[in-house]
Interface confidence: medium
């Protein structure tokens, strides 16, 4: 007992969907879990629309456990998941199915993460292995951003503006993060 367990750092970590038998006590009465935050931020309207509810970049709260190999965070973390469609969708006829289908008109707008926050988590490891500390990047807010035809999805612009505004006093964040850079994956806990 207490022997050093196999340390599986080199293996690829796959996020797993989990179902927890009972919610953690500290989050049991948290009414912000799994709900939209007032429909997100009301965006500026680059094209005319009568119904404001057509713009819906929603911030959904999800509680997750962080996992790394056989290890799992002692407590769940709560982060946002960006959901919804940005920009008014037009109902167009679908000749093949004789039904209706939604297609956004005009530029392509996406509801994507806007700001991130870093959180340090302690991972508990089974079999007598020492706990691990990990820093994870969690989504802090969502925003509608514009995707022009000249850019791929990593080159997103702010909703309603022609160019992305550089944030004052901040170093530019690298756009892409490799899987290895973020070793600790997030595991759904609902």
């Amino acid at each position: 007992q207490g022997w050093q367990a196999f340390k599986n750092d080199a293996t690829e970590i796959i996020p797993e969907l989990g179902e927890y038998p009972e919610p953690p006590p500290e989050l049991e009465n948290n009414k912000t879990m799994n709900r939209a935050e007032n429909g997100g931020r009301p965006p500026h309207h680059p094209f005319e629309t009568k119904d404001v509810s057509e713009y819906s970049c929603r911030e959904l709260h999800f509680t997750r456990y962080v996992t790394d190999g056989p290890c799992r965070s002692a407590k769940p973390v709560t982060e946002l998941v960006c959901s919804g469609q940005c920009g008014p969708a037009r109902l167009l006829p679908n000749a093949i199915g004789r039904g209706k289908w939604w297609r956004p008109s005009g530029p392509d707008f996406r509801c994507i993460p806007d700001r991130y926050r870093a959180q340090r988590v302690q991972l508990l490891c089974p079999g007598g292995e020492a706990p691990r500390a990990r820093k994870v990047r969690l989504v802090a807010s969502c925003k509608c951003k514009r995707l022009t035809r000249f850019h791929n999805q990593s080159e997103l612009k702010d909703f309603g503006t022609e160019a992305a505004r550089p944030q004052k006093g901040r170093k530019p964040r690298p756009r892409a993060r490799s899987a290895k850079a973020n070793q600790a994956e997030l595991e759904n806990a609902y």
């Epitope: 797993e16 969907l17 989990g18 927890y20 799992r72 002692a74 508990l124 079999g127 595991e187």
Partner: nanobody, 120 residues
């Protein structure tokens, strides 16, 4: 007191299959991890596979694609389906149960072990 009882070990030919079971009895907290470890003669105990009460699984590289860990939360039982067995899988297989309460380890239990021998 928690007890872990393993079963299903035995002698099998290379390429064959075995299914190990580990039943936990006693007062067990719902937030837990169950796993299988093995120890070959003259070697250190090593992780084979683990599964959390959430269903999150992890496997040692040497058994990926051949072994499958599963559990029945209602019965507090964990299973290890071992396919395409190789002579190097020969070892004593131990069941482990760790439970978490308010963010810290509450307990760490081990079974007595079951012998798996892969030989022609």
């Amino acid at each position: 007191e928690v007890q872990l009882v393993e079963s299903g070990g035995g002698l099998v030919q290379p390429g064959g299959s075995l299914r190990l079971s580990c039943a936990a009895s006693g007062s067990i907290f719902s937030d837990n991890v169950m796993g299988w470890y093995r120890q070959a003669p003259g070697k250190q105990r090593e992780l084979v596979a683990t599964i959390w009460s959430s269903g999150h699984t992890n496997y040692a590289d040497s058994v990926k694609g051949r072994f499958t860990i599963s559990r029945d939360n209602a019965k507090n039982t964990v299973y290890l389906q071992m396919n395409s067995l190789k002579p190097e899988d020969t070892a004593v297989y131990y069941c482990n149960l760790g439970t978490i309460v308010t963010g810290t380890w509450r307990s760490d239990y081990w079974g007595q072990g079951t012998q798996v021998t892969v030989s022609s």
